[in-house]
Amino acid sequence: SGVFQLQLQEFINERGVLASGRPCEPGCRTFFRVCLKHFQAVVSPGPCTFGTVSTPVLGTNSFAVRDDSSGGGRNPLQLPFNFTWPGTFSLIIEAWHAPGDDLRPEALPPDALISKIAIQGSLAVGQNWLLDEQTSTLTRLRYSYRVICSDNYYGDNCSRLCKKRNDHFGHYVCQPDGNLSCLPGWTGEYCQQPICLSGCHEQNGYCSKPAECLCRPGWQGRLCNECIPHNGCRHGTCSTPWQCTCDEGWGGLFCDQDLNYCTHHSPCKNGATCSNSGQRSYTCTCRPGYTGVDCELELSECDSNPCRNGGSCKDQEDGYHCLCPPGYYGLHCEHSTLSCADSPCFNGGSCRERNQGANYACECPPNFTGSNCEKKVDRCTSNPCANGGQCLNRGPSRMCRCRPGFTGTYCELHVSDCARNPCAHGGTCHDLENGLMCTCPAGFSGRRCEVRTSIDACASSPCFNRATCYTDLSTDTFVCNCPYGFVGSRCEFPVGLPPSFPW
């Protein structure tokens, strides 16, 4: 759709005559009829296929025609067309004399024609005014013409419709060729797609207006490039939503079970060496002079009964000192001044001479010990029971009474109540001081997770458009992770599909 514009500029008819050569009375009151039609190889009479237009009387004999366009007048003359501009045309301009006020063709005598021109033209849309002049023996007509597109029509032949808009159906202005030019922040065929915040993750983020970055379920951060870990995840991270990948030293569904108690709590005291021996479990290896589960107890050096032959031990600042009974001497009262003749062996011990009678040794019966068999054997003196176990003498032997959670001859083995997998339905087992505790997955409860309480929230396939369903184990609900191009709690709404013809 467009307009052929014809600007009449000057008409010269100095003698004031008609085409027949007869003069006009009193002068030639001149008006024009214009016929625009399709290009003809030979211009020939026929219908004005592109339109016609007539002017009022513009002057007498010779005159210049005023440009009236600014005042809403009729010069340039407008010949609108509602088709693709073909680029070529035939143009016929007739100058007529109006003896009276009636300018209708049927009201004029046939010999009222002053002059007639007929040309074949070629004209591109939007070209500058093309000036032409047609001269005959009696008249001269100067005129110019051009073709422009109607509002909202563009292109080489005014065939492209484009209406600028800034609404739900598009955000654009029109280029001279009719192509869309998106407003800042918009893209796509119809400029309906907002350009999200720079760096906004292509899959995990989206936007409804420019420079925005809205995260899809399971993602967070300014650019939606950080996954949201499982609800309740304590010491863990994720690489996809709702994961809980435990940090080093942590375990369990929520990464809240301490697998590295030694590092996280440093329980061993007095420079002892700590060894992890299971979940929330450890063993301290004490430095000399210390004892207790956490090596928190300082040992008296006399506790190891270093003094022999009935010597009595006295603690000192820097160690201990043995007070020897008569007949003995040495750091530990280990040297005797007695011989077998003195019957030094008690409790039925038998005496043997040594070093040609200068010394002796007692061979003690069972349950007795010491240089002179003077001590009843106490098998608990060396604290053989680990992990706080209590040592009990039982005649010739001894036994360890272990604290709860420990077993073995010397209470050296940690008993895990969880070892027999007591938690049903994938429950996670936690060892406690006095027993165990089960953490149940969604859908199960009870002391051993034996009671079914709900079903998998994703079992009913609630997500549309091939979205991924995640069950939120802490709330028994589902979350849909939408593929690109869909939004909504169930990914049921498509994002920004272009309409077929928005106008």
Partner: antibody
């Protein structure tokens, strides 16, 4: 009196060139589209080329496209036809004509003979 | 291209006869057709243009009719000077195309 007078014809070898002229008088030459039309000996009429009144539009028949060029000089009221790479089948009487049936105009020249032969 | 088929290609008639020549276009040319008369060694002379309009100075015994694709030239009463070759020409689209011609001879 309206006159169109062609000149420039003659005998030329195949592959040769000729330039035909058509001098107009007795009418306003610059107002009209002009045509070259030829007639081979004993044959019918055949249109060759067209140029619009201002020279902005030209058309040619397929068999002469790229070889013939039509032009005009309105200040001299003269029409031209530059013929290159001539062939035997171009042998004919060449007429220039001013045709505008809307205005009842139909002016023809008497023609100039072009013979292409070795 | 638009083909113009003219018939007959030749015709013998006597002075005073009514003669009809037809021309058929291969596509619609509206009324953009002319009829020419040519005598040996002369330039063609326009008789009828726009299918049915008589050119100034042409005797009224010549008339044209038709539109679209079928056209007719009629000579109502043949005169001795009318014996010549007649051509139709379509002026609707380039390339301009003529009919093959009809040679009108004295019987």
């Amino acid at each position: 009196e309206v006159q169109l007078v062609e000149s420039g014809g003659g005998l030329v070898q195949p592959g040769g060139s000729l330039r035909l002229s058509c001098a107009a008088s007795g009418f306003t030459f610059s107002n009209y589209g002009m045509y070259w039309i030829r007639q081979a000996p004993g044959k019918g009429l055949e249109w060759v080329a067209f140029i619009s009144h201002g020279g902005g539009i030209t058309y040619y028949r397929d068999s002469v496209k790229g070889r013939f060029t039509i032009s005009r000089d309105n200040s001299k009221s003269t029409l031209y036809l530059q013929m290159n790479s001539l062939r035997a089948e171009d042998t004919a009487v060449y007429h220039c004509a001013a045709l505008n049936w809307e205005l009842g105009i139909d002016y023809w020249g008497q023609g100039t003979m072009v013979t292409v032969s070795s | 291209d638009i083909q113009m088929t003219q018939s007959p290609s030749s015709l013998s008639a006597s002075v005073g006869d009514r003669v009809t020549i037809t021309c058929r276009a291969s596509e619609d040319i509206y009324s953009n057709l002319a009829w020419y008369q040519q005598k040996p060694g002369k330039a063609p002379k326009l008789l009828i243009y726009a299918a049915n309009r008589l050119q100034d100075g042409v005797p009224s015994r010549f008339s044209g009719s038709g539109s679209g694709t079928d056209f007719t030239l009629t000579i109502s009463s043949l005169q001795p000077e009318d014996f010549a070759t007649y051509y139709c020409l379509q002026g609707s689209k380039f390339p301009l195309t003529f009919g093959q011609g009809t040679k009108l001879e004295i019987k």
